[in-house]
């Protein structure tokens, strides 16, 4: 059998291999050692007994999509049946105090590979034996601790394979410089050690993508925007656009990246080298946002120019070095660059919203029959922008972290956007008050710290009689800045 017979459904073409040469990988036309690594078809009854206590699942993930030329990393994790795990020596053991269908196991080991004699396996002096080899016959690499690695992983893609000895998790990185663009299939077959041979325990496949477009994601955020994921934002407030480039192998680390923005509102093109940009829309409507990201990435050197037509008679000597038609691709240590582009497009809707909220006045409400521990305070609030439909207040500790009370209620506000919010405070002390005005699309927040002093019946009565003349003795409001809002607090006398 050949590798492609074992690992794939169909024999890949040489064309596929020629166009996708993976460094360090081998052609799947190579022979597979079926004696050492038996091959079972899907549905073969032997799969049921390939692992004690159930089936092992292999989970294959990758950091796809990969920009062509970058490295793509594949990770395979083995998921053992319940209550089983790999120990420090690479043996498979039962977890302590874990009960599965078979109950608690007396034997701590599922597979005790260490116990299997390392001396009596017919090794030569180098520590190499006829069975410490991969399916193609290549010997296992003797890394420190390699004997604790009891799984053989065979990766297969694009008509090529890669073999790796490992534990219950392995990682393989592949350079994509010569990989055809588009979706590709990676298949992995996993074998476990079994005496002097190996037994298949799991097969898994996953699609990965190689692209010549820089994978670009843009997060959009705006102060006071109620839902950042609905692509609806508020007029007259800056929107922050943050560009995230998916480049897990840091292929573009040394590239100059340019960001070219068109916001779709006739403000022209904006070019930046910063991945974050702010833009304010001053009109309502729907706008088409376009971003083009450009990076000079490492790439293949251009092909050499075609040789000049043959001269009629032989030339006596070589011309100067400048006339040498040696192509760039033949120069060793080539360091050419190619412009790669990424694109992002979104349609965003701009609407009116509540732009700002301010507490302009805080007033103690005098009660003729005051409660023993209760103070009522009125907050006079103004806003700019659209008219709010609800108000929420969150009363919390002075650090504004531990919520004590939260209340939301609908409001009916006139065009002037002036409203009074009354809230009760239980007991004296300092409180943080977060006050939020909201409508369908926006939420505007302001915060203030207030101090509520001890109150006794005499002072309350005196306050009632005097028309509130000693309010500053009762509490003081302190200004707090929140999200660059500047709140002007007026004490009412």
């Amino acid at each position: 059998k050949r590798f492609h017979d074992v690992l794939g459904n169909e024999r890949p073409s040489a064309y596929m291999r020629e166009h996708n040469q993976l460094n360090g990988w081998s052609s799947d036309e190579n022979d597979w050692n079926e004696k050492l690594y038996p091959v079972w078809k899907r549905g073969d009854m032997r799969w049921k007994n390939s692992w004690k206590g159930g089936r092992v699942q292999a989970v294959l993930t990758s950091d796809s999509p990969a920009l062509v030329g970058s490295n793509i990393t594949f990770v395979v994790n083995l998921v053992f049946p319940r209550c089983q795990k790999e120990d420090a020596n690479g043996n498979i053991v039962y977890e302590k105090n874990c009960r599965n269908e078979a109950g608690l196991s007396a034997d701590p080991y599922v597979y005790n590979w260490t116990a299997w004699s390392e001396d009596s396996d017919g090794e030569n002096g180098t520590g190499q034996s006829h069975h410490n080899v991969f399916p193609d016959g290549k010997p296992f690499p003797h890394h420190p601790g390699w004997r604790r690695w009891n799984f053989v992983y065979v990766f297969h893609t694009l008509g090529q394979y890669f073999q790796k000895l490992g534990r219950c998790s392995v990682r393989v990185s592949v350079n994509t410089a010569n990989v055809t663009l588009g979706p590709q299939l990676m298949e992995v077959t996993v074998y476990r050690r079994h005496g002097r041979a190996y037994v298949p325990i799991a097969q898994v496949k996953d699609v990965y993508v190689v692209t010549d477009q820089i994978p670009v994601f843009v997060t959009m955020s705006q102060k006071n925007d109620r839902n950042s994921s609905d692509e609806t934002f508020l007029k007259d407030l800056p929107i922050t656009f943050d560009v995230l480039i998916h480049d897990p192998s840091h292929f573009l680390n040394y590239s100059t990246i340019n960001y070219k923005w068109s916001f779709g509102d006739n403000t022209g093109l904006f070019v930046s080298i910063n991945h974050t940009v702010n833009h304010t829309y001053v009109l309502n409507g729907t706008f088409s946002l376009n971003l083009t990201v450009k990076a000079a990435a490492p790439g293949p050197c251009p092909p050499p120019p075609p040789p000049p037509p043959r001269p009629p008679k032989p030339t006596p000597s070589l011309g100067p070095a400048g006339d040498n038609p040696l192509g760039l691709s033949e120069i060793p240590d080539e360091n050419c660059q190619i412009n790669r582009y990424g694109h992002f497009q979104a349609t965003i809707t701009i609407v009116e919203g509540i732009l700002e909220v301010n507490i302009i006045q805080t007033t103690d409400v005098l009660m003729l029959v005051p409660g023993p521990d209760s103070s009522l305070i009125d907050f006079v609030v103004t806003c700019q922008g659209s008219i709010p439909t609800e108000v929420c207040t969150i009363i919390s500790d002075p650090t504004c972290e531990i919520t004590q009370n939260a209340v939301c209620s609908p409001v009916d506000v006139d065009e002037m956007c002036l409203l009074t919010v009354r809230r009760a405070f239980n007991g004296s002390g300092t409180y943080c008050v977060n006050l939020t005005l909201g409508d369908d699309t926006s939420l505007a927040l302001t915060s203030t710290l207030i101090s509520v002093p001890d109150r006794d019946p005499a002072s309350s009565l005196r306050m009632a009689n005097s028309g509130g003349g000693g309010l500053n003795d009762i509490f003081e409001a302190q200004k707090i800045e929140w999200h660059e809002h500047h709140h002007h607090h007026h004490h009412h006398h």
Epitope: R11, A14, Y15, L181, G182, Q184
Partner: antibody
């Protein structure tokens, strides 16, 4: 839909050069290799070479390596084949064709350009 | 280079007949063989790829089979519009090569 557009005909003199174009549309130009196939009048099909529009990599049959040069212009999604030192042997219909990813069969063909080499 | 040999340059047939065209590769190219139809004055049209896979929209009277070095293209019931030249092509390795073509004509 996928289209490969080629000019209908080119008349050139012996010894001259000609640059044939193939404008691609309806797909991501850089994602598929583009191939060129020659067909002399009344004869069969002969593969000339291929180019990867993403990075400019090329492959040619041995006998055209000094005759044909494949290039692309990504900005216009156009592939070119320049033929030099033309002789009557080069008179033929030249097709551009698109391969299927990792597979070198051709689901999409241009209409072909008839090159006539004549004094 | 891999040589693709179509043994018949011409084949005579009648409408409704079953006809098979053969193609032999000079080495194992399995399963990388495609079949094309070319009508006069037109570009070739892909019918079969990877020996036996019918391309999208191709009528099911066209089938492909074979492995190793021997491949067959079959039209189960020839229609008048099927009269054309048929080419095999190996897409196994570079340089890609075509058979010389088989012209299907009316008896």
């Amino acid at each position: 839909q996928v289209q490969l557009q080629q000019p209908g005909a080119e008349l050139v003199k012996p010894g001259a050069s000609v640059k044939l174009s193939c404008r691609a549309s309806g797909y991501t130009f850089t994602s598929y290799w583009l191939h060129w196939v020659k067909q002399r009048p009344g004869q069969g099909l002969e593969w000339i070479g291929e180019i990867n529009p993403s990075d400019g990599r090329t492959n040619y049959i041995e006998k055209v390596k000094t005759k044909a040069t494949l290039t692309v212009d990504k900005s216009s999604s156009t592939a070119y084949m320049q033929l030099s030192s033309l002789t009557s042997e080069d008179s033929a219909v030249y097709y551009c064709a698109r391969s299927g990813g990792n597979y070198a069969w051709f689901a999409y063909w241009g209409q072909g350009t008839l090159v006539t080499v004549s004094a | 280079d891999i040589v693709m040999t179509q043994s018949h340059k011409f084949m005579s047939t009648s409408v409704g007949d079953r006809v098979s065209i053969t193609c032999k590769a000079s080495q194992d190219v399995s399963p990388s063989v495609a079949w094309y139809q070319q009508r006069p004055g037109q570009s070739p049209k892909l019918l079969i790829y990877s020996a036996s896979y019918r391309y999208t929209g191709v009528p099911d009277r066209f089938t492909g089979s074979g492995s190793g070095t021997d491949f067959t293209f079959t039209i189960s019931s020839v229609q008048a519009e099927d009269l054309a030249v048929y080419y095999c092509q190996q897409h196994y390795s570079i340089p890609l090569t075509f058979g010389a073509g088989t012209k299907l004509e009316l008896k």
